[in-house]
Amino acid sequence: LVPHLGDREKRDSVCPQGKYIHPQNNSICCTKCHKGTYLYNDCPGPGQDTDCRECESGSFTASENHLRHCLSCSKCRKEMGQVEISSCTVDRDTVCGCRKNQYRHYWSENLFQCFNCSLCLNGTVHLSCQEKQNTVCTCHAGFFLRENECVSCSNCKKSLECTKLCLPQIENVKGTEDSGTT
């Protein structure tokens, strides 16, 4: 025996891929709108066309959908140093990035700031600067890494983390001071 589908089961059954349930009649599956368009009117009945309209300037949809409105195009954040890599089209949002010799630092999932890649002065490049990561520097002897810059051990204070790295230097300075000259 084939079990009878009640209203709830019918309501819960999903439409095939590329279609969605008509909001007023869950026995009708309407075809979704293509990317670059949005839903203006649901299909009137089974096998009938959904009324989709193209997104207006300044808006987009990047995938097939049944959205009542297109999404607003993102704006690149000048105050964060961002530049436009590619402009918004009806089917693709604006792509923002950084200038050459800069990297992105993400303060949160959807917010990044552009910073200049470190040049590793008084050190060597351990890992080159990448799109989302600053250069990794290794400092020469007599220098320590502070805020990704190689700083002279003469700027190392006892309270700072640099004391271990600069210990031989500090001892040498002390030794020179302590040794009396005749």
Epitope: R77, Q113, F115
Partner: nanobody, 119 residues
Framework: EVQLLESGGGLIQPGGSLRLSCAAS????????MVWVREAPGKGLEWVSH????????YYADSVKGRFTISRDNSKNTLYLQMNSLRAEDTAVYYC????????????RGQGTLVTVSS
């Protein structure tokens, strides 16, 4: 010397409102993008909101969007954060800061003001 002094924090019931202020001195306030960040107990620093130099472009974290409003008065060298419909998860120390320029760390930020949302 750069100084940022936050005020306006306190104990507030869920659903309530608070207005934080940040008095700035020692630099040209109108030339800087300003930021509000917060640090909840046992959590890292979270970017809450920022406002550009002229107050035209603003940003809000998803967690505060529609509830918080950032503003500034360049004639008074003051940054504000209007916080409405407060929730327990908004409990944190709130700091104002100058947008970093050299790298992803805050060279200049205030001492913070504690906001506690509890019934």
């Amino acid at each position: 010397e750069v100084q940022l002094l936050e005020s306006g924090g306190g104990l507030i019931q869920p659903g309530g409102s608070l207005r934080l202020s940040c008095a700035a001195s020692g630099f040209t306030f109108a030339h800087e993008t300003m930021v509000w960040v917060r640090e909840a107990p046992g959590k890292g620093l979270e970017w809450v909101s920022h406002i550009d130099r002229v107050g035209q472009d603003t940003y809000y974290a998803d967690s505060v969007k529609g509830r918080f409003t950032i503003s500034r008065d360049n004639s008074k060298n003051t940054l504000y954060l209007q916080m409405n419909s407060l929730r327990a998860e908004d409990t944190a120390v709130y700091y104002c800061a100058i947008l970093p320029k050299r790298g992803p760390w805050f060279d200049y930020r205030g001492q913070g003001t504690l906001v506690t949302v509890s019934s």
